[in-house]
């Protein structure tokens, strides 16, 4: 959603669902910055590329970047 | 279940100040847009205004821009229209409707609306 | 802004008969379309959105279809409550959000 005048932040609802890591396509997580005083986590899924916003505070999203990261690390050499 | 309880509206005068509510419950309200749409009388459906789930983000339609302010209490389940310099052509019912927490915006449930009259 | 059309404004029908609702943007919405049926006195309720995906307890008699430009709700066989306004909705990524301005669907 786009960006007010002002504040250039992004998400206007945020998601508590669990996300599938089979699922998605790309995993973006914002920075708070001058711009946008909150931490942002943007999921694009396979299906659609439809996109969604995460909340950063909810437990299964936690869990999820957890296991992002652990599938990250067994990629890098 | 969802619910969305519409109120503070009335009869006023042009030029004239009102401010609406809208109590929700049933839900993680503190993760969830929240969106005023108006029909005015025997017309279609106008979206006025949105603020995001903290009430960083906020957008407004331009016919209602500089005069009318979105809040919420997140606190207390709370969203609030501040309508300043109110005009004749504002005569609607004003419907506090939830994000569909979607990218892409959606209202998946509304309030029972609530009428506000601006004449002289 | 995107402007949506609604047609026809009025449509005439009677229970059992099926209704098809035509919406049409003025530029492309990709399939991001909603549709609202509201009856007197009420607030619109969400049926479908993303074009074609029904809304939590909505009848399988409501079906919407189109991408692009061009979008269509129907309702395979009319019910007495389906007797109501329908709106059309582009949920763009950027505001405002805009409706149609309506079809009426009345008992013939």
């Known amino acids: 959603v786009p960006l007010s005048r002002t504040v250039r932040c992004t998400c206007i609802s945020i998601s508590n669902q669990p996300v599938n890591p089979r699922s998605l396509e790309k995993l973006e997580i914002i920075p708070a910055s001058q711009f946008c005083p909150r931490v942002e986590i943007i999921a694009t899924m396979k299906k659609k590329g439809e996109k969604r916003c995460l909340n950063p505070e909810s437990k299964a999203i936690k869990n999820l970047l957890k296991a992002v990261s652990k599938e990250m690390s067994k990629r890098s050499p | 279940q969802v619910q969305l309880v519409d109120s503070g509206g009335g009869v006023v005068q042009p030029g004239r100040s009102l401010r609406l509510s809208c109590a929700a419950s049933g839900f993680t309200f503190n993760t969830y847009g929240m969106h005023w749409v108006r029909q005015a009388p025997g017309k279609g459906l106008e979206w006025v205004a949105v603020?995001?789930?903290?009430?960083?983000?906020?957008h407004y339609a331009d016919s209602v821009k500089g005069r009318f302010t979105i809040t919420r209490d997140n606190s207390k389940n709370m969203v609030h229209l501040q309508m300043n310099s109110l005009r004749a052509e504002d005569t609607a019912v004003y419907y506090c409707a939830r994000d569909s927490s979607s990218w892409y915006v959606y209202f998946d449930y509304w309030g029972q609306g609530t009428l506000v009259t601006v004449s002289s | 802004e995107i402007v949506l059309t609604q047609s026809p404004a009025t449509l005439s029908l009677s229970p059992g008969e099926r209704a098809t609702l035509s919406c049409r943007a003025s530029q492309s919405v990709s399939s991001y379309v909603a549709w609202y049926q509201q009856k007197p006195g009420q607030a619109p309720r969400l049926l479908i959105y993303?074009?074609?995906n029904r809304a939590t307890g909505i009848p399988a008699r409501f079906s919407g279809s189109g991408s692009g430009t061009d979008f269509t709700l129907t309702i395979s066989s009319l019910e007495p409550e389906d007797f109501a306004i329908y709106y059309c909705q582009q949920r763009s990524n950027s505001p405002p959000w805009t409706f149609g301005q309506g079809t009426k669907v009345e008992i013939k």
């Open positions: 603020i995001s789930y903290d009430g960083i983000i906020k």
């Open positions: 993303d074009a074609s």
